[in-house]
Amino acid sequence: HSFGPGPGLGTPRSPCNARGPCRLFFRVCLKPGVSQEATESLCALGAALSTSVPVYTEHPGESAAALPLPDGLVRVPFRDAWPGTFSLVIETWREQLGEHAGGPAWNLLARVVGRRRLAAGGPWARDVQRTGTWELHFSYRARCEPPAVGAACARLCRSRSAPSRCGPGLRPCTPFPDECEAPSVCRPGCSPEHGYCEEPDECRCLEGWTGPLCTVPVSTSSCLNSRVPGPASTGCLLPGPGPCDGNPCANGGSCSETSGSFECACPRGFYGLRCEVSGVTCADGPCFNGGLCVGGEDPDSAYVCHCPPGFQGSNCEKRVDRCSLQPCQNGGLCLDLGHALRCRCRAGFAGPRCEHDLDDCAGRACANGGTCVEGGGSRRCSCALGFGGRDCRERADPCASRPCAHGGRCYAHFSGLVCACAPGYMGVRCEFAVRPDGADAVPAAPRGLRQADPQRFLHHHHHHHH
């Protein structure tokens, strides 16, 4: 759990400004999940402020790692039954310390708002939210205060009067083996798991359940997950593939089949064919991680979040491993820098996604007057005199291949190369032996290397041309 700079956002900053040390406080606010109220509205379900706050003394410009959250939990007492669906608002406040703080002592550094579904008694839910340059890591859970138990904290438990068993007609209280259910104030038979009451003899249902005793899932039968009643109600059978397979209803909606198609019964606050539309509006700031809230034409209509690359989910709350989409072609190595993707290309490939095959003449041309020659699924450059390398970008050493035969000495020249032949040899590459009797020169068998005198070569060369 931490509050600190988000990834890829430059040098981490301290939350303190130049006016000296500071402390961070966290204000947690709970609102009804289907609240259409303004963001600044009352925290109808409860609110609390963190305590035992550490002091940070870093100053701007100094590096600041992720900051530890204040010790201990922030407990938000809620009134009445736990609704299951709620809006969670976490504000990070900075309190400036010191005599010369000047200006406002309190500043709101960050504010995250999100709609959540959570049953009481469940495990810790983890979350990461980014707002501006800051990232907040936190966990949350809902717990019932004794004697209340259950997903809505609407069932009451009492300590056992006898160590071994509960009183007549009362069951042990799960998950508290040493406690018994208190005498029911709800309507007799009201489901302890799916129903609750706020007044005697009533039975209110949690989302997804219906019926006078909240024992029927919101679907056409009491069988869950598209199963159908078996013969003589012996149980539920799994039918062949049906329209409700995989439950197309989002956000906890219940699916029921209707003449070859399906129908979703949506929990409070959601609507649409698949319960994909939330009653939260853009005014509630539901899009995380730089997501843009796109609403309908009127202010109260549904919203959709357009997520920046790298995030997904209905509220852009899930980070995507963009490299898993394998955007780099031709075996390039993918690097997700947060603010951008980069591809490190294999030799022979280039481009932002390594899409350009340098072994293809349709790609970049050969430099310095070279000609591209394709063949055998690859390309090579036939370079102009004096150039070499893969793309003819390197100045070539024409003498590197020892082109002068019979000990001829090679000299690089602007037009290519010139061979200075050893005595007794002639030709462009010194390939001919000169006969002493003045007969025609004939190709000679290779001999060992011999030194030649450049002066003599030049003299003979000029003499030969005149």
């Epitope: 956002l9 303004a38 963001t39 600044e40 960050a110 504010r111 995250v112 708002v113 707002t131 501006g132 340059t133 853009c282 005014a283 509630d284 700031g285 539901p286 899009c287 995380f288 730089g290 997501g291 843009l292 809230c293 796109v294 609403g295 357009h306 920046p308 690359p309 790298g310 963009r322 955007p327 947060g338 603010h339 951008a340 993707l341 481009g351 932002p352 996604r353 899409e355």
Partner: antibody, heavy 118, light 108 residues
Framework: QVQLQESGPGLVKPSETLSLTCTVS????????WSWIRQPPGKGLEWIGY???????NHNPSLKSRLTISLDKAKNQFSLRLSSVTAADTAVYYC????????????WGQGTMVTVSS | EIVLTQSPGTLSLSPGERATLSCRAS???????LAWYQQKPGQAPRLLIY???SRATGIPDRFTGSGSGTDFTLTISRLEPEDFAVYYC?????????FGGGTKVEIN
Amino acid sequence: QVQLQESGPGLVKPSETLSLTCTVSDDSISNYYWSWIRQPPGKGLEWIGYIFYSGTTNHNPSLKSRLTISLDKAKNQFSLRLSSVTAADTAVYYCARVFNWGFAFDIWGQGTMVTVSS
Amino acid sequence: EIVLTQSPGTLSLSPGERATLSCRASQRISRTYLAWYQQKPGQAPRLLIYGASSRATGIPDRFTGSGSGTDFTLTISRLEPEDFAVYYCQQYGTSPLTFGGGTKVEIN
């Protein structure tokens, strides 16, 4: 460094369709949102709309009925078509890349002036 | 749509002075999704600040953004000659994306 270049006719007649293209160089058009913004002479900036490489689009409601934004991955280009133009559509039209930390604009083309006149 | 009102319309200052530009939103901007741009004559705007307070790449630290909710501020601590330009704020929390009318910072 990524570069954006707008292209298209500088003069369009009233009631006709304004068509502009933005060519993206030194970066792939994939994995970003791409946007159009305009600025009438001597006035402020007005967002027109954006497109994602997946095909997701979002338009300014004031222009939505006349606006089409499309994308050509093969050519690394995206385009704007604004129908039934009037003199009020005379502006410098900019294409821009949407920043990856949110819908601000971190890289802009140099802009192209479009005049609507008969 | 969220309307952004910038003030003052024009700010006449000398090099070395401090400039404070204001941007006020007609409704709360979620998650400080606000950006600032600088535009010089004949040029495209340049992103200075995003997330209300984070400097974009290559922006000098004399540019500082602050604020949340409906009130945001861009501060230029010591004006350099190249800072005289028009500055726009933009919100990107709710569609449609909207810009303020601009503040012109001119040499006094």
